[in-house]
Interface confidence: low
């Protein structure tokens, strides 16, 4: 493992029909509450169980929503974006960016973590290695006493 992580970015048009509880997902982001460093885009933070988005199955937590019914979501306050979704009507067309993590072959969705964050294995591997070195040093030191 060389620690390198690549990202495969794909875009998709997703058409949702508003259900009894709305579109069935929560969003984060906006110019006043950036979810990703240097990116004021709108991201899906949670897919509600049995909601319209969950039943459709294509929208994923961590996806970036680029537009709603053709209206760009760039440079919007968070609440502006919320209002836009609330008033988008019954049939809603979303332009979505999926960011897939490609790590040594297998492709897995990033999920709900911070899309700009460090993948957890990059933290865990060095921590594990340090722990092993410390344990070995401790055992060796004990044997010398």
């Amino acid at each position: 493992m060389n620690g390198r992580v690549d990202y495969l970015v794909t875009e998709e048009e997703i058409n949702l029909t508003r259900g009894p509880s709305g579109l069935g997902f929560n969003i984060v982001g906006g110019t006043d509450q950036q979810y990703v460093s240097n990116d004021s885009g709108i991201y899906v933070s949670r897919i509600k169980e049995n909601g319209a988005a969950a039943l459709d199955g294509r929208l994923q937590e961590g996806d970036k929503i680029l537009s709603v019914n053709g209206q760009d979501l760039k440079n919007l306050l968070h609440q502006d974006a919320v209002d836009l979704f609330r008033n988008a009507g019954y049939a809603v067309s979303l332009r979505v960016q999926h960011r897939l993590q490609v790590q040594n072959g297998p492709i897995g969705h990033r999920g709900e973590g911070d899309p700009s964050g460090i993948p957890i294995f990059m933290v865990l591997v060095p921590v594990f290695a340090l722990t092993m070195v410390a344990a070995w040093a401790f055992m060796r030191y004990r044997q010398q006493l």
């Epitope: 760009d72 760039k74 440079n75 919007l76 306050l77 609440q79 502006d80 209002d83 836009l84």
Partner: nanobody, 120 residues
Framework: DVQLVESGGGLVQPGGSLRLSCTAS????????MGWVRQAPGKGPEWVAT???????HYRNSVKGRFTISRDNAKNTLHLQMNSLKPEDTAVYYC???????????????RGQGTQVTVS
């Protein structure tokens, strides 16, 4: 003191057009969400259209494609171009200011006195 003054209402035949204007004083409209709400006789206030500080606009479904909201930052004026008017568009139209840059409020302190639009 914040003040909103609407103009441009009137009596028009079905299918006709009107252009409403709202002049704001006391703050720059470009830094807020601004919009229009309307109130028909005996009914509650109804949201019509919003323009955000970013320039993004959105409309209630029944007016989409017929109404266009815009603003003139230099003149600090908000406009609502209303085409293909229908009898159900009859109402008093109020210019409204967003609170914290977002939600439109219909309480007196957040809107103008209104301008009557009658489609008949």
């Amino acid at each position: 003191d914040v003040q909103l003054v609407e103009s441009g209402g009137g009596l028009v035949q079905p299918g006709g057009s009107l252009r409403l204007s709202c002049t704001a004083s006391g703050y720059p409209i470009s830094t807020y969400a601004m919009g229009w709400v309307r109130q028909a006789p005996g009914k509650g206030p109804e949201w019509v259209a919003t323009i955000y500080y970013s320039g993004v606009t959105h409309y209630r479904n029944s007016v989409k494609g017929r109404f266009t909201i815009s603003r003139d930052n230099a003149k600090n004026t908000l406009h609502l171009q209303m085409n293909s008017l229908k009898p159900e568009d009859t109402a008093v139209y109020y210019c409204a200011k967003g609170v914290n840059g977002t939600y439109l409020r219909v309480e007196a302190e957040y809107r103008g006195q209104g301008t009557q639009v009658t489609v008949s």
